[in-house]
Amino acid sequence: MAVTACQGLGFVVSLIGIAGIIAATCMDQWSTQDLYNNPVTAVFNYQGLWRSCVRESSGFTECRGYFTLLGLPAMLQAVRALMIVGIVLGAIGLLVSIFALKCIRIGSMEDSAKANMTLTSGIMFIVSGLCAIAGVSVFANMLVTNFWMSTANMYTGMGGMVQTVQTRYTFGAALFVGWVAGGLTLIGGVMMCIACRGLAPEETNYKAVSYHASGHSVAYKPGGFKASTGFGSNTKNKKIYDGGARTEDEVQSYPSKHDYV
């Protein structure tokens, strides 16, 4: 029961986390810039991974996409890549984890298979979360180190044209969403990995023995399929008792006349 709860909670937490990573990646407010020296209207400038927006105090907002790849900074491209990898891994992890959930029955899937799938999805969630955290942190570092043109005054040398660069850049909401979402995905992944340990098939009480009926070439294995999985307590194939019953090794090693037709 605890294993199912841990697995289910891990799935839900990861689901929320991945939804957050997708939201952060699509958000425009990765970095924000306030302008105060404008006598016409207050202008609020903010940038995302895909486009830049300007909002006026009147409410008018204009957003334009980055239609060039060549002119984009390598760091921005790296952040994009990290976020996309995080989303893709997370999405695959979610798909795998749905089939791995203990509460969902799919055919005759064994607990060992579900355990493996849970572990796989858990690792995917962990990597996904780390990618998101790394991506957001790289972008935040770019802002902190004034990656965006930190020069106070730039003289172009053309007829006294002066460009005064404003650099009041602050962390946008997307950064915090990304950090939280990445953390949740990471936690969800850890929970899935923990749940995997509890899902691993335990040793059965069935004895892996073959009952040899005298005069008939019929092998009867109590417990059906599970008895032959090799997870029984009689793992060393020791002789249990005499009287027509032999271990599987013995049956194979010493064929009787009934074994051949």
């Epitope: 810039q33 302008l35 020296n37 404008n38 016409v40 209207t41 202008v43 400038n45 940038q47 486009r51 830049s52 300007v54 006026e56 105090s57 009147s58 409410g59 008018f60 204009e62 334009r64 996409g65 980055y66 002119g71 984009l72 900074p73 921005l76 965006w148 043109m149 044209m161 002066v162 460009q163 005064t164 660069v165 404003q166 650099t167 009041r168 850049y169």
Partner: nanobody
Framework: QVQLVESGGGLVQPGGSLRLSCAAS????????MTWYRQALGKEREFVAG???????NYADSVKGRFTVSRDNAKNTVYLQMNSLKSEDTAVYYC???????????????WGQGTLVTVSS
């Protein structure tokens, strides 16, 4: 890099009219606000009029009712229609644009080299 070029300045009699224009060119990503400033000889540069891309405009008290600012967003050009000109309007008129040359760069102040308007009889 964004370049601003002003034109339309010249000598005009008091009570006359002039139309200044300022065209932005170069690597332009976005120009939210375009503004006119002026600087008379021996005085500080002062705000005249400005207009945002959303259509919000503002004027200095000294030119209200006489000057009209307009903008052609498609051409990245701002105009200043000056009517009922007075001798105190004599100054070098500068065009200012708050713009970004690339979307991932912050908005910056770009200035033109100025055009001289002389109001004299």
């Amino acid at each position: 890099q964004v370049q601003l070029v002003e034109s339309g300045g010249g000598l005009v009699q008091p009570g006359g009219s002039l139309r200044l224009s300022c065209a932005a060119s170069g690597s332009i990503f976005s120009i939210p606000v375009m503004t006119w400033y002026r600087q008379a000889l021996g005085k500080e540069r002062e705000f005249v009029a400005g207009i945002s891309k959303g259509g919000t405009s503002n004027y200095a008290d000294s030119v209200k009712g006489r000057f009209t600012v307009s903008r052609d967003n498609a051409k990245n050009t701002v105009y200043l229609q000056m009517n009922s000109l007075k001798s105190e309007d004599t100054a070098v008129y500068y065009c200012n644009a708050q713009a970004s040359s690339f979307g991932w760069m912050p908005l910056s102040d770009y200035w033109g080299q100025g055009t001289l308007v002389t109001v004299s009889s």
